[in-house]
Interface confidence: low
């Protein structure tokens, strides 16, 4: 409903707004202030999103999917603000929104293109499948389809298996890489171009260590400065692989500076932690401590995996008793 009076038609301008799944956004629209303001927001020029006239909302014909999700800035309408506050955007909300504003002297049309992105924090996992070792970069929910790249010793590699499952609103992606028998370092990057968000996973294998029973072992874990920002929340987990599955020995949360230790012979050096060095000691080794030890430093932007192989051999005393 627009006032039947002489008015000037102002041509349309268009703006792109990027939203993140489940977040609130604002679709901007402004106009030359005037009296008898009428505001209609429409989706794809057909679904009614929000209507306002005669000084109040009129939502009787609002499309049900927008119920309780939209509002205007009522104290700002008289200043020329017809922007729409939009709660909890979903991928189904993507598209073109048109704002029609009429006053006593003009009608203006503003178009806003809404693009919605998803980027749940990816993970890099190390898995044993029979006799093979795999690195898997995966992201549970991402939209639009991301760009995934692998590097071996800082050189891009073309082998890039993508296992993709698409749901109604996003993709779930696994990218496995067979690294059986390799001592190289690997890096996987997942990029969401819409949200301009990049995540990197890095995997480094350290030389194997041979230790005698009852000795102790020190295993290093220092983040690579290129990725690591101590100001950002991160988590460090040390785990040991036993018959194909990892059991957690200890973890550290930067947000609370809490250390939780599940293995009594495990120790962390608090002073080193303060210098972002997460190397650990395992005391009083026994034969069953042989295996792979994994340090995982993870934040929203990266996962750094460092793996050590430890071989514990019987001490001379033990051997002479047998």
């Amino acid at each position: 409903i627009f006032p039947l009076a002489f008015f000037i038609y102002v041509p349309m301008n268009e703006q792109i707004v990027i939203g993140r799944l489940d977040e609130d956004i604002i679709l901007p629209s402004s106009f030359e202030r005037g009296s008898e303001v009428v505001i209609h927001w429409k989706y794809q020029d057909s679904y009614k999103v929000h209507s306002y006239y005669k000084g109040s909302d009129h939502l009787e014909s609002q499309d049900p999917r927008y119920a309780n999700r939209t509002s205007l800035f009522y104290n700002e309408i008289q200043n020329g603000n017809a922007s729409l506050f939009f709660r909890r955007v979903s991928l189904l909300d993507e598209g073109i929104y048109t704002c029609y504003v009429g006053t006593a002297i003009q009608v203006i049309t503003n178009k806003v293109v809404l693009k919605v992105g998803v980027f749940l924090t990816p993970v890099m996992k190390y898995e044993k499948r029979n006799t093979n070792s795999f690195l898997i970069c995966s992201v549970l929910s991402v939209y639009p389809r991301p760009i995934i790249t692998w590097k071996m010793d800082n050189t891009p590699i073309s082998e890039n298996n993508m296992e993709e499952t698409g749901s109604l609103d996003s993709f779930s992606i696994n990218s496995p890489l067979n690294i059986t028998g390799s001592n190289s370092s690997y890096e996987c990057t997942i990029e969401n171009s819409l949200l301009k968000q990049t995540w990197t996973g890095r995997w480094t294998m350290k030389d194997g260590l041979h230790k005698m029973q009852s000795e102790h072992v020190s295993l290093s874990c220092q983040p690579v400065n290129d990725y690591f920002s101590p100001n950002q929340d991160f988590k460090v987990t040390w785990s040991r692989m036993k018959s194909g599955t990892f059991s957690v020995l200890a973890y550290y949360l930067s947000s609370s500076q809490n250390t939780i230790i599940n293995e009594s012979r495990f120790s962390w050096n608090k002073e080193l932690i303060n210098q972002s060095d997460f190397s650990m000691n395992l005391m009083d080794l026994n034969l069953s401590d042989s295996g792979e030890y994994l340090c995982n430093i993870s934040s929203d932007e990266y996962t750094l995996l460092t793996i050590h192989t430890v071989h514990v051999e019987p001490s001379q005393e033990t051997a002479s008793h047998n």
């Epitope: 990027i18 939203g19 977040e23 604002i26 104290n75 506050f85």
Partner: nanobody, 115 residues
Framework: DVQLQESGGGLVQPGGSLRLSCAAS????????MGWHRQAPGKQRELVAL???????NYADSVKGRFTISRDNAGNTMYLQMNTLKPEDTAVYYC?????????WGQGTQVTVSS
Amino acid sequence: DVQLQESGGGLVQPGGSLRLSCAASGSRFSFNVMGWHRQAPGKQRELVALISSGGTANYADSVKGRFTISRDNAGNTMYLQMNTLKPEDTAVYYCTATTPVGQYWGQGTQVTVSS
């Protein structure tokens, strides 16, 4: 009562930089979307940049690539880093914060770009 306090405005030469800050307080709700608007003398107030609670940023075409909006982890302080400033960026810059129950405005801080 919600209060927004801008700071960091001033006089700067063309090509220079300024960093505006906005501290928000007094809301029972979290600030879903925060933003910067500006109003030059004799002109309509215009949107400069918006940032959502998760850090997703949107910019007016006129400032893309020059201005960067950010907010702290607690979500109550917002910044606008303005680089390569031009005389046409001269305006009063207003901080806005949106909660589920309304939009709030600061008093504004003057930015003047002149040689």
